[in-house]
């Protein structure tokens, strides 16, 4: 048998060479071309274990994309036909709790997460026989990467589930901690930095493999809080990074997520986007916005993928992506997954599983409205590869898709048999569909979140609502003491007001200059390279946010060190998450407050407002009876007509849908 | 313009159940989030329930959750508050009101544009 060369197993402390056999009814026999369903007998530490996979067909939608640029640095779209994939999910037969995660492409490579263990599989290089080495994830060498935090073991879990009868692929795979009864789809788009590619080859299809293993393995393991990943996109800057990487993992977020808004949004529409990129923080793995995920602004983050496995760089992505889902570091928390670390501790273990504190951080999101944009199953233009009725995701070809027939029978729109709408029904989901009817047009289906927002309202001929839009960056708000930013009013009392509650406003500006001079992390201008940044004397109101009149202390699943500063008759409160230096500190200023006359907070600095490009004259564009939007439309007040509020009507704008029903004006009069 | 007229008040017994009406008119109704507030004797205007027309998104006071049901029927231009398990402390006057903001506001009454006229609820013990 062929030895394993040093390179693929310098990373690991111990593993066993085996070669799996594939599984017939008739036979056990040597591998053949992959299909929809197979199954396996592998070996692991004496024992033999079957495993049974289906092709993962939730993955990639049908217009799964990707963007590269050529020489002169065009953008080229790309639409791959990968339709009949080689990534697979499945479990381990007479095993609790177990999932997989694997591609057969060229062998087996992939993840098993066994009841007490994860292992991964890999082809042995240079076989002629199948053979492949197996390995505990816990015995794969790491270096000591971090999310801020010092790493702190966690309990280990003892419950176990009671099983009747042999439970069918889908009720295995969403039987783990479901910790909602209602399946969230998170729409993921990758970018690929150009060390990265580099570091590939320059080998597009290998990259494109690569991060398509990735996302299988993704979702094998946010399966267990019954959230799918659905890889929408994947860009790879072939010809250059398209933001500055110099400087802290910070700036490289922040300078991510403006690119992303920017540039990328109007691309192809995702929920988050995550960053991989080669260059290392100097031991952080990675950087991310908590609970942001459905944010024009900040639904981001950033990974880093050095000298480690992809398998192991899935669990520093799943960390990441799980901060934008709302979830806190684990540490300090009670939190317990069953394994000895989890996914959300702070120190970058490799885990594959989520905590408890997890599954709660991810619950309170989902209640407090911020995961709203995972609920929409992806359009049939989205929906993801080798359709399939049946499997509650709208795919190319389907009116709809109410699941198992089971499920079905309580849909009263939807065939199941055929996953077409019913002879009598328009529509069987979505915001603007009730009881299998289009909602009037004119029927508010996404109301007012702030008063830098503007509703929008159903078409009357279509389930879904109008595209999300708000009031342009830069319009006054709050009697002018204030700019609207990505939809909402940013002012200090405001956000006083959220961190210590209602009676809470902002502390005298002599607070901010005097706290947040001392370069230390409770008063700060950001974080460069190992230390914070002391701010000048005029960027001291967009450091650490400083409140007074403070009645309440915060709790939100994460206990802060919170520091009172006497100052001129007056006590400055200011707080630390200690979230870690892989996530941006809500305790600092928001971006977009009003620091001055004329004046914005932006990476930590008091700019010229003008970096907003706000350049809407309601006065002449909308004739003083609206606002522009994010479009630079006008959104008309109630009595005035889009599209420039000239002649009388019923508001709104030609992004917004009709306020009110055109086709059946008897109905409403 | 949007106008709304409540009905369906009443007295009732402790434990007995009502359902309040509100009826929109206005060519631009089906624009608005619909929510009930009270105004109990001695005390402050308080939220009691919101929706909106499609009947997916609900929201309700802690002290009425699992008794009380907003419904909405598009069709008929009305909302519905079906009261059960009525207390004394329920005794108010209901009003209904329209708003255009989402959920993160409904709960405020200042952000309402449109108000009824209100329908008194009595629950004697």
């Known amino acids: 048998a062929a030895r394993p060369g040093f390179q693929q197993t310098s990373h690991l402390s111990s593993y066993e060479i085996i070669t799996p056999w594939r599984l017939t009814r008739e036979r056990r026999e040597a591998p053949r071309p992959y299909s929809k369903q197979v199954s396996y007998v592998i070996q692991a530490e004496g024992k033999e274990h079957i495993i049974h996979l289906e092709r993962n067909k939730d993955l990639l939608p049908e217009d799964f994309v990707v963007y590269t640029y050529n020489k002169e640095g065009t953008l080229i779209t790309d639409h791959p036909n990968i339709q009949n994939h080689c990534h697979y999910r499945g479990y381990v037969e007479g095993v609790h709790n177990s999932s997989i995660a694997l591609s057969d492409c060229f062998g087996l490579r992939g993840l098993l997460h066994l009841e007490n263990a994860s292992y991964g599989i890999e082809p042995l290089q240079n076989s002629s026989h199948f053979e492949h080495i197996i390995y505990r994830m816990d015995d794969v060498y790491k270096e000591p990467l971090k999310c801020g935090v010092s790493n702190k073991d966690i309990e280990k879990e003892t419950a176990k589930d009671e099983e009747e009868e042999p439970p069918s692929m889908t009720q295995l795979l969403r039987r783990r901690r479901a910790v909602l009864p209602q399946t969230r789809y998170v729409e993921l788009f990758i970018v690929v930095d150009k060390e990265r590619y580099d570091m590939m080859g320059r080998n597009q299809t290998a990259v494109r493999e690569e991060m398509i293993l990735l996302a299988n393995y993704l979702d094998s393991m946010y399966i267990m809080l019954n959230i799918r990943i659905v890889l929408v996109g994947l860009e790879i800057w072939t010809n250059g990074n398209l933001i500055n990487i110099v400087g802290g993992a910070g700036d490289v977020l922040g300078n991510f997520v403006q690119w992303r808004e920017k540039f990328l949004i109007t691309r192809r529409r995702h929920d988050s986007a995550q960053l991989v990129l080669k260059k290392g923080f100097g031991g952080t793995a990675g950087m991310a916005f908590v609970g942001t995920v459905c944010s024009r602004s900040h639904a981001g983050g950033i990974n880093v993928f050095g000298q480690i496995t992809v398998e192991t760089f899935a669990s520093i992505v799943a960390h990441e992506l799980g901060h934008n889902l709302g979830m806190n570091h684990d540490d300090g928390r009670d939190c317990s997954c069953g394994a000895k670390s989890c996914i959300m501790n702070s120190g970058a273990s490799g885990s594959r599983n989520f905590s408890s504190c997890s599954a709660e951080d991810f619950e309170k999101l989902t209640l407090n409205k911020g995961g709203n944009c995972l609920l929409n199953i992806p359009k049939p233009d989205e929906a993801y590869s080798a359709p399939s009725c049946g499997n509650k995701l709208v795919d190319a070809g389907e009116e709809c898709d109410c699941g198992t027939p089971k499920e079905c029978e309580l849909d009263p729109c939807c065939e199941g048999s055929t996953c077409k709408l019913k002879s009598f029904a328009e529509c069987a989901y979505g915001d603007c569909c009730k009881d299998c009817r289009f909602l009037p047009g004119g029927t508010l289906c996404r109301g007012k979140t702030s008063e830098c927002d503007v509703p929008e309202y159903c078409n009357g001929s279509s389930q879904f609502c109008q595209p999300d839009v708000f009031i342009q960056n830069g319009y006054p708000c709050q009697n002018n003491k204030a700019y609207c930013y990505n939809g909402m009013c940013q002012y200090y009392d405001a956000q006083c007001q959220v961190i210590f509650g209602s009676k809470a406003k902002a502390a005298p500006k002599d607070c901010f200059i005097e706290v947040n001079s001392k370069g230390d992390r409770f008063g700060n201008c950001g974080f460069s390279g190992n230390e914070y940044k002391k701010c000048a004397t005029g960027n001291a109101l967009c450091g650490k946010l400083q409140c007074e009149n403070v009645q309440e202390i915060p709790v939100f699943g994460i206990v802060p060190a919170i520091i009172q500063t006497p100052s001129r008759g007056t006590k400055c409160w200011g707080v630390d998450f200690q979230l870690g230096s892989d996530v941006p500190d809500p305790g600092m200023v928001n971006e977009g407050t009003k620091c001055g006359a004329g004046k914005i907070c932006r990476n930590f600095q008091c700019v010229d407002a003008s970096v907003l490009n706000y350049d809407c004259d309601v006065q002449k564009k909308c004739h003083g009876h609206g606002v522009c939007n994010s479009n630079k439309n006008c959104h008309c007040e109630n009595g005035w007509a889009p599209p420039n509020c000239e002649t009388k009507g019923y508001g709104g704008s030609v992004d917004s849908g009709p306020t009110y029903n055109e086709m059946n004006t008897a109905l409403r009069d | 313009e949007v106008q709304l007229v409540e009905s369906g008040g009443g007295l009732v017994q402790a434990g007995g159940s009502l359902r309040l009406s509100c009826s929109s008119s206005g060519r631009t109704y089906s624009a608005y989030n619909m929510g009930w507030f009270r105004l109990r004797p001695g005390k402050e205007r308080e939220f009691v329930a919101a929706?909106?027309?499609?009947?997916?998104?609900?929201d309700y006071v802690d002290s009425v959750k699992g008794r009380f049901t907003a419904i909405a029927d598009v069709a008929k231009k009305t909302v519905f508050l079906q009261m059960t398990s009525l207390k004394p402390e329920d005794t108010a006057v209901y009003y209904c009101?329209?708003?255009?903001?989402?959920?993160?506001?409904?709960?405020?009454?200042?952000?309402?544009?449109?108000w009824g006229q209100g329908t008194q609820v009595t629950v004697s013990s």
């Open positions: 009101a329209a708003t255009q903001w989402g959920s993160s506001g409904w709960k405020q009454a200042r952000w309402y544009d449109f």
């Open positions: 929706i909106n027309w499609s009947g997916g998104t609900q």
